[in-house]
């Protein structure tokens, strides 16, 4: 799947032992960019003309509880998840003629998180076992980052995403969202 | 297709607590944010929380914090929501709805279930 | 939290008239801007997403615009069928809001 938003809901990232999460598996809903509508008529679509500059994260917080194998945290932590349409696309046809689908337009804009904060959590763990004192990174705040697809691999990494691609009889589709995209990152940190 | 389908109408004593749930088919269930909103009779709708089904990480409105429990269930798709300390005013028809990835609106909504909350 | 006003709360029309609802929101939500119609007894049903994008299958006379703290949504021609309850909704920030609805009548 091409260009994943950043997801950070897995919010558990260790600074020393934390590893980035993985791409989101595919997502299959794509009528927003390829359906046939307005009875063929050019479709019309929000986010065809704007300046980038109109474009701004989403601020959804979410709370979870921090795991490390058997234990977990006595209190929840809360964090924002980075998302949202961060910049333009323009519109092509579909093979039909009728529907549409989204490409970038040359650069591609990243809601992605900017400032974190550090929190420090008490692990409870079953079997009389000590509590455990770990450090959290959270996310504090999001921003629109402006990419390239040249960008490499390594140059990638914090975005939690691949180089952008569209996936094999796939149409590309910036900006979508996964609820998945960031599991791996608690279950990869010890 | 996508179906999000929910559990039947429920009556409740004052103090009681109810779980209701919503059956997710047709889609990858771990892929979208679920929502709850309800509906109170001849009133508008309300939004309630949100969860990640694949981590399970949640977002309370602060009116029901603390009287709220959303929770998944990965193996049968199927979402949860509990509301507890029930009182009259939560008589309403609560809704699960699936978020669209790309744009940020509700593409999908449960049947609604009505719960009455009467003594 | 974000505060949704939406007005008027509710509006009696012709058919064929052209109906305006507004909504405004408390602080910029960029255009995280969904409009919902609602009938008696049934889920609310996606009209508008994100401000100006008309959903599939929804009738091209309906329309939305607006971007930051002011929007609309326009019925160009209203049909009979065009009857219920709309709600404006952002999806910006948590708490998601909805406005508090404006009622539609056919005159």
């Known amino acids: 799947q091409g260009w994943q938003a950043f997801k950070n809901d897995a919010t558990e990232i260790i600074p020393e032992l934390g590893e980035y999460p993985e791409p989101p598996p595919e997502l299959e809903n794509n009528k927003t960019m390829n359906r046939a509508e307005n009875g063929g008529r050019p479709p019309h679509h929000p986010f065809e003309t704007k300046d980038v500059s109109e474009y701004s994260c989403r601020e959804l917080h979410f709370t979870r509880y921090v795991t490390d194998g058997p234990c977990r945290s006595a209190k929840p932590v809360t964090e924002l998840v980075c998302s949202g349409q961060c910049g333009p696309a323009r519109l092509l046809p579909n093979a039909i003629g009728r529907g549409k689908w989204w490409r970038p337009s040359g650069p591609d804009f990243r809601c992605i998180p900017d400032r974190y904060r550090a929190q420090r959590v008490q692990l409870l763990c079953p079997g009389g076992e000590a509590p455990r004192a770990r450090k959290v990174r959270l996310v504090a705040s999001c921003k629109c980052k402006r990419l390239t697809r040249f960008h490499n691999q390594s140059e990638l990494k914090d975005f939690g995403t691949e180089a952008a691609r569209p996936q094999k009889g796939r149409k590309p589709r910036p900006r979508a969202r996964s609820a998945k995209a960031n599991q791996a990152e608690l279950e990869n940190a010890y | 297709q996508v179906q999000l389908v929910q559990s039947g109408a429920e009556v409740k004593k004052p103090g009681a607590s109810v779980k209701v749930s919503c059956k997710a088919s047709g889609y990858t269930f771990t892929n979208y944010y679920m929502y709850w909103v309800r509906q109170a009779p001849g009133q508008g709708l309300e939004w309630m929380g949100i969860i990640n089904p694949s981590g399970g990480s949640t977002s309370y409105a602060q009116k029901f914090q603390g009287r709220v429990t959303m929770t998944r269930d990965t193996s049968t798709s199927t979402v949860y929501m509990e509301l507890s300390s029930l009182r009259s005013e939560d008589t309403a028809v609560y809704y699960c709805?699936?978020?669209?990835?790309?744009?940020?609106?509700?593409?999908?909504w449960g049947q609604g279930t009505l719960v009455t909350v009467s003594s | 939290d974000i505060q949704m006003t939406q007005s008027p709360s509710s509006l009696s029309a012709s058919v064929g008239d052209r109906v305006t609802i507004t909504c405004r929101a408390s602080?910029?939500?960029?255009?995280?801007l969904n409009w919902y119609q609602q009938k008696p007894g049934k889920a609310p049903n996606l009209l508008i997403y994100a401000a100006s994008g008309l959903q599939s299958g929804v009738p091209s006379r309906f329309s939305g615009s607006g971007s930051g703290t002011d929007f609309t949504l326009t019925i160009s021609s209203l049909q009979p069928e065009d009857f219920g309850t709309y709600y404006c909704?952002?999806?910006?920030?948590?708490?998601?809001?909805f406005g508090q609805g404006t009622r539609l009548e056919i005159k």
């Open positions: 602080q910029t939500i960029s255009n995280y």
């Open positions: 709805a699936r978020e669209d990835t790309a744009m940020a609106y509700f593409d999908y």
């Open positions: 909704q952002q999806s910006f920030s948590t708490p998601i809001t």
